[in-house]
């Protein structure tokens, strides 16, 4: 669809005569009629099958003619047609005398004719307007052309309909040739589909208007690239929505059980060695000079009484000092300047000369010891207790306190690993001479069958159109991630198409 | 009087060209579609070439495109038909004519031979 | 290319009978039509032009009518200058053709 414009320029009629050579009375009131039609080989007589248009009266004789408007006509005429423009067309211009203010046809005599002009022409849609002039011994006519496309019209020949949209059924602009040009967020063949945030995911994201990024189910972030793990998981990431593998040093099915209590808690003390020995679990190994179960205790140099013969005990810095009794020397007080007649033995112990006379030793009752038998007897000292277990004096007896994990009056029995029940989710307990073993039953796995290896539900495939399955291991199901134009809680149902348009 | 009068005609071999021309007067030369029609001994008319009015379309017959070349020059009212790579099958009475029918106007010129020969 | 049937392709007559010429088209020329006469040596001249319009200067005993596909040149009373050759030229598209002519001679 589009018009042929017709825009007359000058007529040049000097004399005021008709075609007939008859002059006009008084001058040669000049109207036009136009017939616009097909092209033929030769011109000939015929239907105006593309239009025709006559003006009213636009001067007498010789007169120019105003673009817009000239006395109610239009200047450029318009012919508009509804078909494909061909690109080549007959046109036929006659300009007429109106004796009266009657300018139908059948109201004129057949002289009243000035002149008549009949080319073929050729014309592109959208060309400028192309300038031609007609001359014949008494008149000259001169006129220019063109052909433009209707509003929503586009194309070589104005048959492609374009109309721009901005709503639902497409976001476009149209360009000269008719081809869609998407306004700016969106693309697609009918500009229908946003241009989501960049970077979004193409198969985790999507979006709805421009510049969005929603995500889809089991994923998160601005751009839906992260997977969102298993509800509950605590020191675990997911690769793949649902899941929660354990960072190291964590275990169970949302990794929330230590396995490493000694990087995460540092509870040895004093530069003291830790060691992972199970589930919240460590030993700790002291450094000389500390004890307790986090080596947290200092050990006194003088613990061991190392001063002998009645001698005291002083703690220095860089280790001790022995104060001897009267009759006594050396570093530990172990060199005597008595003999039996000094009666050096204490606490009842008898004395007996040797190296005739030059010294003397002393036998002590039971419970005391020493050179002297000036020190009562600590139990703690032939280190009695087993499995790293903590020996404490208690009057005239001793006890043993025990590590995790053994017990006995010497924390001699190895408590079972089995006892407090390690094994998740009904796994059997085997112990072992290091440790302890479990057995998981179908659908669990790990140290303590503490992952869930349930059986897989996304295995029957119950996505359609190309959907990424994933299993849900909280409640032993599957989510469907749709690709882009499906929805359906199984991606079953297509997103409505649009109806198809005629361009 | 109206006057269309063509020359250039001959005798000529095979492959080689002649230009025909067309003079004419008596009306306005710059206002009508131009036409070359032929006809060989003995045998009927045949439409040639076309051009119209402003030289803007030019319409060949599918023997002659391509060797052929039909022009004006409206200042010189005066049409022409370049004829190149001639075969025997070209041999006519050239005719140059203005028709408009529209407009009641059917001009001949009288003709010119060529004979296209080894 | 449109294709013009021209019938018959000579016919023998005497002065003052009644001559009909038909041309048939192979699709609708929409009466772009016209009908020549041609004698030997000289130029074709225009007898009837839009299948039924008599060419200024042409005797009324030419006519033309017809439409469509189908198209009849008659000559109502032969007059000894009548006897030549009669073409019909179709001008609606391009190629134009002529048909393959009339010989009418006296009998």
């Known amino acids: 669809s589009g018009v042929f414009q017709l825009q007359l320029q000058e007529f040049i009629n000097e004399r005021g005569v008709l075609a007939s050579g008859r002059p006009c009375e008084p001058g040669c009131r000049t109207f036009f009629r136009v017939c616009l039609k097909h092209f033929q080989a030769v011109v000939s007589p015929g239907p105006c099958t593309f239009g025709t248009v006559s003006t009213p009266v636009l001067g007498t004789n010789s007169f120019a003619v105003r673009d817009d408007s000239s006395g109610g006509g239009r200047n450029p005429l318009q012919l508009p047609f509804n078909f494909t423009w061909p690109g080549t067309f007959s046109l036929i211009i006659e300009a007429w005398h109106a004796p009266g203010d009657d300018l139908r046809p059948e109201a004129l005599p057949p002289d009243a004719l000035i002149s008549k002009i009949a080319i073929q022409g050729s014309l592109a849609v959208g060309q400028n307007w192309l300038l031609d002039e007609q001359t014949s011994t008494l008149t000259r006519l001169r006129y220019s052309y063109r052909v433009i496309c209707s509003d929503n019209y586009y194309g070589d020949n104005c048959s492609r309909l374009c109309k721009k949209r901005n709503d639902h059924f497409g976001h476009y602009v149209c360009q000269p040739d008719g081809n869609l040009s998407c306004l700016p967020g969106w693309t697609g063949e009918y500009c229908q589909q946003p241009i989501c945030l960049s970077g979004c995911h193409e198969q985790n994201g999507y979006c709805s208007k421009p510049a969005e990024c929603l995500c889809r189910p089991g994923w998160q972030g601005r751009l839906c690239n992260e997977c969102i793990p298993h509800n509950g998981c605590r020191h675990g990431t997911c690769s793949t929505p649902w899941q929660c593998t354990c960072d190291e040093g964590w275990g169970g099915l949302f990794c929330d059980q230590d396995l490493n209590y000694c990087t995460h808690h540092s509870p040895c003390k004093n530069g003291a060695t830790c060691s992972n020995s199970g589930q919240r679990s460590y030993t700790c190994t002291c450094r000389p000079g500390y004890t307790g179960v986090d080596c947290e205790l200092e050990l006194s140099e003088c613990d061991s009484n190392p001063c002998r013969n009645g001698g005291s005990c002083k703690d220095q810095e860089d280790g001790y000092h022995c104060l001897c009794p009267p009759g006594y020397y050396g570093l530990h007080c172990e060199h005597s300047t008595l003999s039996c007649a000094d009666s050096p033995c204490f606490n009842g112990g008898s004395c007996r000369e040797r190296n005739q006379g030059a010294n003397y030793a002393c036998e002590c009752p039971p419970n005391f010891t020493g050179s002297n038998c000036e020190k009562k007897v600590d139990r703690c000292t032939s280190n009695p207790c087993a499995n790293g277990g903590q020996c404490l004096n208690r009057g005239p007896s001793r006890m043993c306190r025990c590590r995790p994990g053994f017990t006995g009056t010497y924390c001699e029995l190895h408590v079972s690993d089995c006892a407090r029940n390690p094994c998740a989710h009904g796994g059997t307990c085997h112990d072992l001479e290091n440790g302890l073993m479990c057995t998981c039953p179908a659908g669990f796995s790990g140290r303590r069958c503490e992952v869930r290896t349930s059986i897989d539900a996304c295995a029957s495939s119950p996505c359609f159109n190309r959907a990424t399955c994933y299993t849900d291991l909280s409640t032993d199901t599957f989510v469907c991630n749709c690709p882009y134009g499906f929805v359906g809680s199984r991606c079953e149902f297509p997103v409505g198409l649009p109806p198809s348009f005629p361009w | 009087e109206v006057q269309l009068v063509e020359s250039g005609g001959g005798v000529v071999q095979p492959g080689r060209s002649l230009r025909l021309s067309c003079a004419a007067s008596g009306f306005t030369f710059s206002n009508y579609g131009m036409y070359w029609v032929r006809q060989a001994p003995g045998k009927g008319l045949e439409w040639v070439a076309f051009i119209s009015h402003g030289g803007g379309i030019t319409y060949y017959r599918d023997s002659v495109k391509g060797r052929f070349t039909i022009s004006r020059d409206n200042s010189k009212n005066t049409l022409y038909l370049q004829m190149n790579s001639l075969r025997a099958e070209d041999t006519a009475v050239y005719y140059c004519?203005?028709?408009?029918?529209?407009?009641?106007?059917?001009?001949w010129g009288q003709g010119t031979m060529v004979t296209v020969s080894s | 290319d449109i294709q013009m049937t021209q019938s018959p392709s000579s016919l023998s007559a005497s002065v003052g009978d009644r001559v009909t010429i038909t041309c048939r088209a192979s699709?609708?020329?929409?009466?772009?039509l016209a009908w020549y006469q041609k004698k030997p040596g000289k130029s074709p001249k225009l007898l009837i032009y839009?299948?039924?319009r008599l060419q200024d200067g042409v005797p009324s005993r030419f006519s033309g009518s017809g439409s469509g596909t189908d198209y009849t040149l008659t000559i109502s009373s032969l007059q000894p200058e009548d006897f030549a050759t009669y073409f019909c030229l179709q001008g609606s598209k391009f190629p134009l053709t002529f048909g393959q002519g009339t010989k009418l001679e006296i009998k």
């Open positions: 699709e609708d020329i929409y009466s772009n």
């Open positions: 004519a203005a028709l408009n029918w529209e407009l009641g106007i059917d001009y």
């Open positions: 839009a299948a039924n």
